[in-house]
């Protein structure tokens, strides 16, 4: 069969090979398409099918406006004046080029190091569906690679049968990367030999959050080992401005205290032994934990354990500076 590609809504003429150019003609057109259940033989006299396909005086078949339901096989069997039979066989496929794709809900700013929605690419009115793809600085973006994720949706219009495609792009920009990346989206038609359609590019700014300097936890006495009844002071040092809120944890459990950068443990008893750390919470960066320090009791004559070893735990008597 000869492959024919026709644009939806456009006319199409299929020639009946071997047919005399004028009546009388011995020919028969039949079709098997989305409008038929099996083969439909068209009456040369015309009829209700004429709005879809009708036989012209020269024997050709005329489709005034090709539709999705006209995809299928068209066959003509003709006999010339000498009684020689010729068959024509066409496989018709239809297409519709959508409007230029657009990027909607586009971000003007992205944050490095975290996932960001870049925008949603929309293409309306294609057939067959086709595909959307994203580009960064002119190069194709591969979903599920290097912090790139794409959420796609395809809808079909209930009356026209044409497709609407949507593609939402999420990226995690690398720290220290291009501060003004260029994103674009393109629609590739489902039928071959048709050019891709491109959106206008968007160029969001990449914002680099200033990395928080490490949260320092200072313990006095050094090493965190103290005689029974002694005092331990824990100080949480955060260079960030404005000062973040400081909370305290013991053995992984938050302590029910008001936020404070200093924690004093007076008159140490066995119940105060354990692993302590502070948590600095900055509005734009989220929580940051310090290293853990171990507080332990040493009996007279013992050497203090090194910082970081774990002692016992229990409800202690806590005081805030």
């Amino acid at each position: 069969a000869q492959n024919i590609t026709a644009r939806i809504g456009e006319p199409l003429v299929l020639k009946c090979k071997g047919a005399p150019k004028k009546p009388p003609q011995q020919l028969e057109w039949k079709l098997n398409t989305g409008r038929t259940e099996a083969w439909k033989v068209l009456s040369p006299q015309g009829g209700p099918w004429d709005s879809v396909a009708r036989v012209l005086p020269n024997g050709s078949l005329f489709l005034p406006a090709v539709g999705i339901q006209d995809e299928g096989i068209f066959r003509c069997q003709a006999m010339n004046r000498n009684g020689k039979e010729t068959k024509s066989n066409y496989r018709v496929r239809v297409y519709q080029i959508p409007g230029k794709p657009e990027i909607i809900d586009s971000a003007s700013e992205l944050t490095a190091g975290v996932p960001n929605k870049v925008g949603t690419c929309v293409s309306e009115g294609s057939y067959p569906a086709g595909t959307l793809s994203w580009h960064l600085d002119g190069k194709p973006l591969v979903p599920n690679e290097k912090g790139v994720s794409v959420k796609e949706e395809t809808r079909r219009h209930p009356e026209t049968g044409l497709f609407t495609l949507q593609s939402e792009l999420m990226v995690t920009p690398a720290r220290g990367g291009n501060p003004h990346p260029t994103f674009s989206c393109s629609f590739s038609p489902g039928l071959p030999r048709r050019r891709a359609l491109h959106t206008a590019p968007i160029q969001p700014r990449v914002w680099e959050p200033v990395p928080l300097e490490e949260v320092q936890l200072v313990v006095e006495p050094e090493g965190g080992a103290v005689a029974p009844g002694g005092t331990v002071t824990l100080t949480c040092e955060v260079p960030a401005q404005p000062s973040p809120q400081i909370h305290w944890m013991k053995d992984g459990v938050p302590l029910p205290l008001s936020p404070s950068p200093v924690l004093i443990l007076p008159e140490i008893g066995p119940q105060d032994q354990g692993t302590y750390r502070c948590v600095a919470t900055h509005p734009s960066h989220g929580p940051q934990e310090s290293r853990a320090v171990s507080i332990s009791i040493i009996e007279p004559g013992e050497e203090g354990p090194t910082a970081g070893s774990v002692g016992g735990s229990g409800p202690g008597t806590l005081a805030l500076a």
């Epitope: 409008r35 038929t36 259940e37 099996a38 439909k40 009456s43 006299q45 015309g46 009829g47 209700p48 099918w49 004429d50 709005s51 879809v52």
Partner: antibody
Framework: EVQLVESGGGLVQPGRSLKLSCVVS????????MTWIRQTPGKGLEWVAS????????YYPDSVKDRFTISRDNAKSTLYLQMNSLRSEDTATYYC????????????WGQGVMVTVSS | DIQMTQSPSSMSVSLGDTITITCRAS??????VNWFQQKPGKSPRRMIY???NLADGVPSRFSGSRSGSIYSLTISSLESEDVADYHC?????????FGSGTKVEIK
């Protein structure tokens, strides 16, 4: 709202002529084939004539061919049926309907107009 | 020409009954069969299009089906407002042909 309103019916003698009109509203007239269908008293429905949307192709059953002519004026959104050489068997209620091709099978009908052929 | 043989010509039924009217096409007309309802003194109204599709505004108790060349209109749980004449139509070939009609009455 789609409306089809027929007019021009009446009593006519055999052999004479009559012209029916159908004014439509509520849809884009030149997008649709149009058809006349008749119903004889106490009898079934019978297809009379169809015309394609541009008006350049017309279709008739043998019973009215060469006597009846269907036409349309897309600018006026009006369908016509010119009936010549009328016979008593043409006595019927004539309906103007939207459609006539395989894409639209008579989804809207006018109220009908009575034509009586009698001497 | 295609013949559309419609049966029965009339039926007398009770409210709440399920009824089926059939039309047999003398040759293949594919899906191109419509069903119309006509109440006394009124214009026909399309009920089913392309053999099986319910037209807009038609109650769901009406349905259309097809088995080969036999096309059926079924009304389940008949209501008093369904009393009417019913006509089938083939619109696949000229001349377009209607069935002879079925009169549905209440016992």
């Amino acid at each position: 709202e789609v409306q089809l309103v027929e007019s021009g019916g009446g009593l006519v003698q055999p052999g004479r002529s009559l012209k029916l009109s159908c004014v439509v509203s509520g849809f884009t007239f030149n997008n649709y084939w149009m058809t006349w269908i008749r119903q004889t008293p106490g009898k079934g429905l019978e297809w009379v004539a169809s015309i394609n949307n541009s008006g350049d192709n017309t279709y008739y059953p043998d019973s009215v061919k060469d006597r009846f002519t269907i036409s349309r004026d897309n600018a006026k959104s009006t369908l016509y049926l010119q009936m010549n050489s009328l016979r008593s068997e043409d006595t019927a209620t004539y309906y103007c309907t939207r459609g006539g091709d395989i894409t639209t099978g008579f989804d809207y009908w006018g109220q009908g107009v009575m034509v009586t052929v009698s001497s | 020409d295609i013949q559309m043989t419609q049966s029965p010509s009339s039926m007398s039924v009770s409210l709440g009954d399920t009824i089926t009217i059939t039309c047999r096409a003398s040759q293949d007309v594919g899906i191109y069969v419509n069903w119309f309802q006509q109440k006394p003194g009124k214009s026909p109204r399309r009920m089913i299009y392309r053999a099986t599709n319910l037209a807009d505004g038609v109650p769901s108790r009406f349905s259309g089906s097809r088995s080969g060349s036999i096309y059926s209109l079924t009304i389940s749980s008949l209501e008093s407002e369904d009393v009417a004449d019913y006509h089938c139509l083939e619109f696949d070939e000229h001349p377009l042909t209607f069935g002879s009609g079925t009169k549905v009455e209440i016992k």
